[in-house]
């Protein structure tokens, strides 16, 4: 028995204690935030601790419940939206998860005026997506893959579309990799501002190879779950973008919107789809070879009944250096012309920020410019436009919101939340009233989360909405790492880290190092916001530095960082976490004979073939959900970076960035591989080629798999596996149990 | 002034095709929806078929479904229905009308076909 | 299908008289998707009441339509000479678009 003297001699700081894993699984140190739900730009809903359904008024400061718990509780609702006209309410009940963003539920239409569920012509059930219009109450809502209108809750409903298919064609909804890699919603609908028009995307999946893998569930057969899915080359939907009067629906029916010209010659996508006025909608395409985007602006031309989409408001945005955009091509923001709007894409000096187009993108006024990125424009009033971007301070994984004065002239700007809470707050996002006349300031770090509102005009603080006193209070006896956010410079790129250290650090002793990394195109892990997760554990508990490094394809450090990794995705991503590890060592605290990487997803293909890089830099590592070649990856996102894996193309970099290639080189290493069987993102295919590969070649390792599971790995199989990784470790490291 | 002018009816035998052309003029014809509605003689009206303004949805009756195609050249502004596998019960004057399920505020002014041996 | 189903089958009156043409839907329809035309003999139908129950282009305001749900109205204020013919009542809220069979207007 070792006696170990104690760390602490006063009875304050005796009472401290590590991080267990127990609390990172059960959830014990997780923060709220506070959105308003804004009805108005004065008013906003907001879902109370008891679950009654709160309307604030911000200037009388008066709240009333529009639905109780009870009505709620009445069909085990556990989601809301309240009509425009403010008559209706629909509730959400019978939740069922599909995909990232897609899910099926029930639906109940509450007529507030009576107090009553509407009776007839009731919703059909499950409903794949339902909304309102934007005024008024009409609802569009997608039943088995069709689009159907009703002009109120209790009418009977105008069925859109008929040829909707399961896994052929989609109305209103995305197919899979539409939904994962393009729109990010499980929507493909969109009203027009006053609720006139509805415009909506129909994919046509009939020509896409179909993934299948089985989900065992608890029969005596397994199922086959059966996805249309464009792998990197393989055939992809054929979008078609179709606007239809919602007034009378049944006359001229569903109008479809021309594709440009310099689109429709290739393979092309749909990206988004933006109103700007009843009559005038903008829709953004982009070649199948993501470096040409170009945005549409159509109009209605009432005497002809149709959508008119000319040249002349065709908009070409084109990358030289890699793909268009960012993660995803940037949407306009349109001023009070209805016609003009700000967009962010990159200057001439390779930074991503944001312009003001008038007529053409030549002649775009720069309206942001620096070494550093405009990330988000929030909103744009008459004479104020508000975005969030990292310049303050030079620190590219913070986030602070600007206000730019564009009524005037020169416009000034103003930082919002640099200075408000400055230690405690420097990663902010925000949510603005109708006319931005009050807004809500979210902080996500890098202290305890906040969410506050604030005026407007005079962006006074008006209340705390959120301030996680109880986390406060419970992390009061906790011994919370350290964690520091610093760059190095090498070869003239500059790799952001942010290092994770235990409570009692001491810079004279040797720790394991374990490296947690992501690394996909534009991605960014070393951000300034809080968080209690396993890492956390692994330094407060088990004594491990944990670092994240930013490497060459990460974020909003410029064009030159991002696009790096074009066309060559694998290489440079490795080895910059590669040269951030030597540069650990350098530091003298690191034991280097104890070194591991993990993974998740891109993360898990990056750890890999770090372990694989021959380096003998590490001892272990752990990849969960990996990809392992490009070829059994989506389409869209795939060929953005590495465009097509074709002999002509860029076949050669498809086959030796695969982890298989490798598998040899894993011999020296200890190797956890772990997957979900049912992940309908990155193929269980993708670790079962590793695995056979690894046996092939007879290299030992160590592999979990999680029956039934997707790529978030979610539910007890999180317990499992993060217990599971942590023995991992632990053994790795010698450290005990 | 809108007008729509249909033509290609006449008598065919059981199994046999036709095909009814609809020639529209005095208005933006690629923008709007057309249908097909039928009336058999003596009887009331059937809508046969419809086809948005770019072509790119087409629907039929239950009846047709099949047998019938409904198409549209908007470049030389004519409506088109292919009629294959005829049957007596098809006999009737159709109309072309400008509409897509309702509405239809202009019609043509009848070919007659008639399916006899 | 939505079964419409016209009443009565012939309405004989004089001019100068209401008419009152009545349509049932065998399910609900709103006056949204329903539309009224007037057929008269070796003619093409022609529009009355647009959906919506707006009157067509050219329509004399003696036509009207009325009615929600599953029962319809159209009135013809006062009949004029040429207002005897073949009424349809059609609906276009589900696929196939259908049309009662029909309410003749005969002179009394």
């Known amino acids: 028995i070792v006696l170990r003297p104690s760390r602490v001699h006063n009875s304050e700081e005796n009472t401290m204690r590590a991080l267990t894993l127990k609390d990172i699984l059960n959830g014990t140190f997780s923060y709220k935030t506070f959105f308003p739900n804004w009805i108005s730009g004065q008013e906003y809903l907001h879902q109370s601790a008891d679950n009654n359904i709160v309307l604030y008024n911000i200037e009388t400061g008066q709240s009333y419940t529009i639905l109780s718990n009870r009505t709620m509780k009445s069909v085990n609702a556990s989601n809301y939206g309240l009509s425009p006209d403010r008559q209706f309410v629909y509730l959400e009940s019978d939740y069922s998860k599909l995909w990232r963003y897609s899910y099926t539920a029930t639906y109940y239409i509450y007529d507030l005026s009576n107090g009553e569920f509407v009776r007839g012509n009731e919703l059909p059930r499950p409903i794949q997506y339902l909304c309102w219009s934007p005024v008024g109450s009409k609802l569009a809502y997608v039943y088995q893959n069709n689009i159907y209108l009703k002009q109120r809750p209790g009418d009977p409903p105008f069925q859109i579309t008929f040829n909707g298919r399961e896994n052929k064609i989609f109305n209103g909804i995305p197919d899979w990799v539409y939904e994962e890699e393009m729109l990010a919603t499980k929507y493909a609908l969109w009203w027009s501002p006053n609720g006139k028009f509805l415009a909506y995307a129909e994919f046509n999946d009939t020509d896409i190879p179909v993934i299948a893998y089985s989900y065992y569930g608890d029969e005596q057969y397994p199922r086959t779950i059966n996805i249309p899915y464009p792998k990197a080359g393989a055939k992809n939907p054929v979008v078609r973008i179709f606007i239809i009067d919602t007034t009378y629906p049944a006359y001229v029916g569903p109008q479809e919107v021309p594709v440009p010209a310099m689109i429709a010659s290739s393979d092309y996508y749909f990206s988004w789809l933006t109103w700007v006025t009843d009559e005038r909608v903008c829709l953004q395409w982009l070649k199948r070879v993501q470096n040409v985007s170009v945005l549409s602006i159509c109009d209605f031309r009432e005497d002809w009944q149709t959508w008119d989409c000319p040249k002349t408001q065709e908009h070409i945005e084109e990358s030289r250096t890699g793909w268009a955009g960012g993660f995803f091509v940037s949407t306009p923001v349109f001023s009070y012309d209805a016609i003009s709007y700000y967009k962010i894409f990159s200057d001439k000096d390779g930074y991503k920020h944001i312009h003001y187009i008038k007529d053409t993108v030549e002649n775009a006024i720069q309206i942001t410019s620096g070494k550093w990125e405009a990330i988000n424009i929030f909103r744009v009033t008459q004479d104020s436009l508000f975005y969030s971007s990292n310049e303050f301070e030079e620190y590219p994984g913070r986030r602070n919101i600007y206000r730019i004065s564009i009524g005037s002239y020169p416009p000034s700007k103003k930082c919002v939340t640099c200075h408000l809470r400055k230690e405690r707050c420097q990663y902010y996002t925000a949510s603005f009233s109708d006319y931005a006349k009050y807004y809500a300031l979210v902080c996500y770090g890098p202290g305890i989360p906040i969410s506050t509102l604030h005026d407007g005009r005079t962006d006074q603080e008006i209340k705390i909405l959120e301030e996680n006193k109880e986390l406060e209070n419970a992390l009061k006896n906790i011994q919370l790492p350290k964690e520091e956010i610093k760059k190095l410079e090498v070869d003239e790129i500059t790799l952001w880290y942010k290092m994770i250290l235990p409570p009692q650090f001491d810079r004279s002793k040797k720790y394991p190092l374990l490296i947690q990394v992501y690394g996909g195109p534009c991605s960014q892990s070393v951000r300034s916001v809080f968080a209690v997760n396993w890492i956390s554990y692994l330094a407060s508990k088990e004594g491990m530095v944990i670092a994240l490094v930013d490497g060459r394809g990460t974020a909003f450090q410029g064009d030159k960082l991002l696009y790096a990794v074009y066309r060559k995705l694998g290489v440079y991503e490795v080895e910059d976490q590669i040269t951030a590890v030597r540069k650990f060592i350098e530091m003298g605290f690191i034991d280097e004979k104890r070194i591991a990487i993990w993974g998740w997803s891109y993360g898990g293909y990056v750890s890999s073939l770090a372990l694989a890089s021959g380096t003998g830099l590490f001892k272990c590592g752990i990849a969960v959900a990996p990809v392992s070649s490009w070829e059994y990856y989506a389409s869209v996102y795939t060929e953005r970076f590495m465009g097509l894996p074709t002999k002509d193309d860029n076949l050669e970099h498809y086959k030796n960035s695969t982890v298989m290639a490798r598998a040899e080189y894993f011999r020296n290493v200890d190797y956890l591989l772990i997957h979900g069987t049912a992940d309908d993102n990155v193929h269980f295919q993708n670790s079962a080629q590793i695995a056979k590969a690894l046996v092939n070649a007879q290299v030992d390792f160590q592999a979990m798999w999680y029956s039934d599971q997707n790529h978030g790995l979610s539910g007890l199989s999180t317990n499992h596996l993060y217990t599971h990784m942590t023995h991992f470790l632990k053994q790795c490291f010698s450290l005990s149990d | 002034e809108v007008q729509l002018l249909e033509s290609g009816g006449g008598l065919v035998q059981p199994g046999g095709s036709l095909r009814l052309s609809c020639a529209a003029s005095?208005?933006?014809?690629?923008?709007?929806?057309m249908s097909w509605v039928r009336q058999a003689p003596g009887k009331g009206l059937e809508w046969v078929s419809g086809i948005i303004g770019s072509g790119g949805i087409t629907y039929y009756a239950d009846s047709v479904k099949g047998d019938f195609t409904i198409s549209r050249d908007n470049s030389g502004n004519t409506l088109y229905l292919q009629m294959n596998s005829l049957r007596a019960e098809d006999t009737a004057v159709y109309y072309c009308?400008?509409?897509?399920?309702?509405?239809?505020?202009?019609w043509g002014q009848g070919t007659l076909v008639t399916v006899s041996s | 299908e939505i079964v419409l189903t016209q009443s009565p089958g012939t309405l004989s009156l004089s001019p100068g008289e209401r008419a009152t043409l009545s349509c049932r839907a065998s399910q609900s329809v709103t006056s949204s998707y329903l539309a009224w035309y007037q057929q008269k003999p070796g003619q093409a139908p022609r529009l009355l009441i647009n959906v919506g129950s707006r009157r067509a282009t050219g329509i004399p305001d003696r036509f009207s339509g009325s009615g929600s749900g599953t029962d319809f109205t159209l009135t013809i204020s006062r009949l004029e000479p040429e207002d005897f013919a073949v009424y349809y009542c059609?609906?276009?809220?589900?696929?196939?678009?259908?049309f009662g069979q029909g309410t003749k207007v005969e002179i009394k």
């Open positions: 059609q609906q276009g809220i589900m696929l196939p678009p259908t």
């Open positions: 009308a400008k509409g897509w399920f309702g509405g239809f505020n202009y």
């Open positions: 005095g208005f933006t014809f690629s923008s709007y929806a």
